[in-house]
Interface confidence: low
């Protein structure tokens, strides 16, 4: 492969915003490879050598009055300006989450399982995901992947609940996000639809069978009691 | 007090590759970058270009300054080269996977430098190029880099995928595998027993009950025909 030595220069002009644009901090940062060697910080007002490598630049740039005036004004001319230009599609961007709940492992009831609440495609990244069992919040046994940035201005996160599902239990994943006016909830019941229909079929069939049997026996014996004068036809000897 | 938002204009220049990058980052997402060859602004999401504009020529001037600075710094550092930092690679999907439901595989390449990487998608071991897309090199707070590669796909039980990453910090290409994990249905033993027994008992009950009903009705009719003794 290509084994030639590599040399990298990085520059980062950073604008840090607090409480909208009420407080703004501007940083002009220079790096050789990963090492920052000189920076201008609007809180300081001058260039400052971060390592010895940057001392000549700090001293030279600090002697340039016009450059410093430009950098000191950057919180307004650069930071606040760019914030205003991009605000509508960055700061104000809202994309609501898609929420799906499913069991991670396919286990029968009363076995350890992991219920997954998959929250996808939302923006911004600030989100609150909670698990509830029968209306009570579950705080123990909750594991999360943390916030995952998809790189396309959306985020996703998986929040898992370690539990032993029991018949009839209702699990709820509740999501709060700036795009939602009220919390979004998705329920999962501790029995699958096929299992439920099997149970209903079995119980329904059983009840129906008992009804028929009961009705048959009732009709049969009622008629027997009502006509006691009639001798039953016996076997011919 | 934690800041609410951060906008970063990030630039780099790499020698001897003579590759440069100019991009704007908002809270870790790319707003746009400048295509150095085409000398044009490329918006990360198409709609951004409807709200703002950026003169690409300004970025080219900055890159020229970065190149000059790099040459000064290289001499000043006594020609100390960069130390390769190999990437961490993760493959994930854009949303929960359902059979034959379109989805996107994401290959996330993280914590590496220098910003040069070769990424290939493999389906069943063969390179795939249709529909693939990627981001530019994204800055990190520790001044290493991140990058995303995307592959739209239709999940099936037959196909397996790999994201293959080459970097100078790696001794050999790194492959991260992904395949569809088909959930085996729950055994539902109790439900099956209840269903079988219920239906069996029900069926037997219905048959026997019907027989008794018929017999009872017949008996009643016969008695009525004969009349009292």
């Amino acid at each position: 492969g290509d084994t030639r030595p590599r040399f990298l220069e990085q520059v980062k002009h950073e604008c840090h915003f607090f409480n909208g644009t009420e407080r703004v901090r501007f940083l002009d940062r220079y790096f050789y490879h990963q090492e920052e060697y000189v920076r201008f910080d609007s809180d300081v007002g001058e260039y400052r050598a971060v390592t010895e490598l940057g001392r000549p630049d700090a001293e030279y740039w600090n002697s340039q009055k016009d450059l410093l005036e430009q950098k000191r004004a950057a919180v307004d001319t650069y930071c606040r300006h760019n914030y205003g230009v991009g605000e509508s599609f960055t700061v104000q961007r809202r994309v609501y989450p898609e929420v799906t709940v499913y069991p991670a492992k396919t286990q029968p009831l009363q076995h350890h399982n992991l219920l997954v609440c998959s929250v996808n495609g939302f923006y911004p990244g600030s989100i609150e995901v909670r698990w509830f069992r029968n209306g009570q919040e579950e705080k123990t046994g909750v594991v999360s992947t943390g916030l995952i940035q998809n790189g396309d201005w959306t985020f996703q996160t998986l929040v898992m609940l370690e539990t032993v599902p029991r018949s009839g239990e209702v699990y709820t994943c509740q999501v709060e996000h700036p795009s939602l006016t009220s919390p979004l909830t998705v329920e999962w019941r501790a029995r699958s639809e096929s299992a439920q229909s099997k149970m209903l079929s079995g119980v329904g069939g059983f009840v129906l069978g008992l009804l028929f049997l009961g009705a048959g026996l009732f009709i049969y014996f009622r008629n027997q009691k009502g006509h006691s004068g009639l001798q039953p036809t016996g076997f011919l000897s | 007090i934690k800041e609410e938002h951060v906008i970063i204009q990030a630039e780099f220049y790499l020698n001897p590759d003579q590759s440069g990058e100019f991009m704007f980052d908002f809270d870790g997402d790319e707003i746009f970058h400048v295509d150095m060859a085409k000398k044009e602004t490329v918006w990360r999401l198409e709609e951004f270009g409807r709200f703002a504009s950026f003169e690409a020529q300004g970025a080219l001037a900055n890159i020229a300054v970065d190149k000059a600075n790099l040459e000064i710094m290289t001499k000043r550092s006594n020609y100390t080269p960069i130390t390769n930092v190999p990437p961490e690679v993760t493959v994930l999907t854009n949303s929960p996977v359902e059979l034959r439901e379109p989805n996107v595989l994401i290959c996330f390449i993280d914590k590496f430098t220098p910003p040069v990487v070769n990424v290939t998608w493999l389906r069943n071991g063969k390179p795939v190029t249709t529909g693939v897309s990627e981001t530019v090199f994204l800055p990190r707070e520790d001044h290493l880099f991140r990058k995303f590669h995307y592959l739209p796909f239709l999940p099936s039980t037959e196909d397996v995928y790999d994201c293959r990453v080459e970097h100078w910090g790696l001794d050999e290409p790194l492959l991260k595998h992904w395949e569809f994990d088909a959930p085996s249905p729950l055994p539902e033993t109790t439900e099956n027993v209840v269903c079988a027994l219920g239906l069996t008992v029900g069926l037997v009950g219905i048959i026997i009950g019907t027989i008794f009903i018929i017999k009872g009705v017949r008996k009643s009719n016969a008695a009525e025909r004969r009349g009292p003794l």
Epitope: V44, G45, R48, E59, S63, L68 | -
Partner: antibody, heavy 120, light 109 residues
Amino acid sequence: QVQLKESGPALVKPTQTLTLTCTFSGFSLSTSGVGVGWIRQPPGKALEWLALIDWDDDKYYSTSLKTRLTISKDTSKNQVVLTMTNMDPVDTATYYCARSPRYRGAFDYWGQGTLVTVSS
Amino acid sequence: DIVLTQPPSVSGAPGQRVTISCSGSESNIGSNYVSWYQQLPGTAPKLLIYDNNQRPSGVPDRFSGSKSGTSASLAITGLQSEDEADYYCQSYDYDHYVFGGGTKLTVLG
């Protein structure tokens, strides 16, 4: 408004350690860029910079006096303390504390000064 | 530790213009800002000029500063009797503040 005031002994014996305190108001030493420095002036002579402490606790000392000086701050009390060991009659001077509003900035506010005499 | 060189004294009649020079090197004045202080007899120094040529509020515009290469100068126009004082230049040398030896300004007559 910004005010600084030096306090400490008026008389120190040779070889003793001098401890001076600068108590200030009207600004905070936790504000980015701010520093508080000490400057002295022997009678009839020029100003001589001694030391400075930054908002982020970086400390800077005069090369010739580095081994004898220690500067520290107590942000909550709005105080900066300078200690100078092994005092000598040549250290007799008026000692001033002053504020620098930003990194490498000028000293925009000064205390009134305190005269320290070194004599046995 | 006097690193910056100033003339020991200058003088001028009321209404005249006087300049005080301050000479340093590449590592101090050459690379950093220069400040000027006025010290009236028996008082603490007062900031007169910062960032080579900037006046704090309250300082009359009769006082001006300039810098060229490794030298700086303070100019006082329309000299007044209350300007009689010691004047010090100050700059920065790597991690150290440096002062000049001071110049005594005498207002004649």
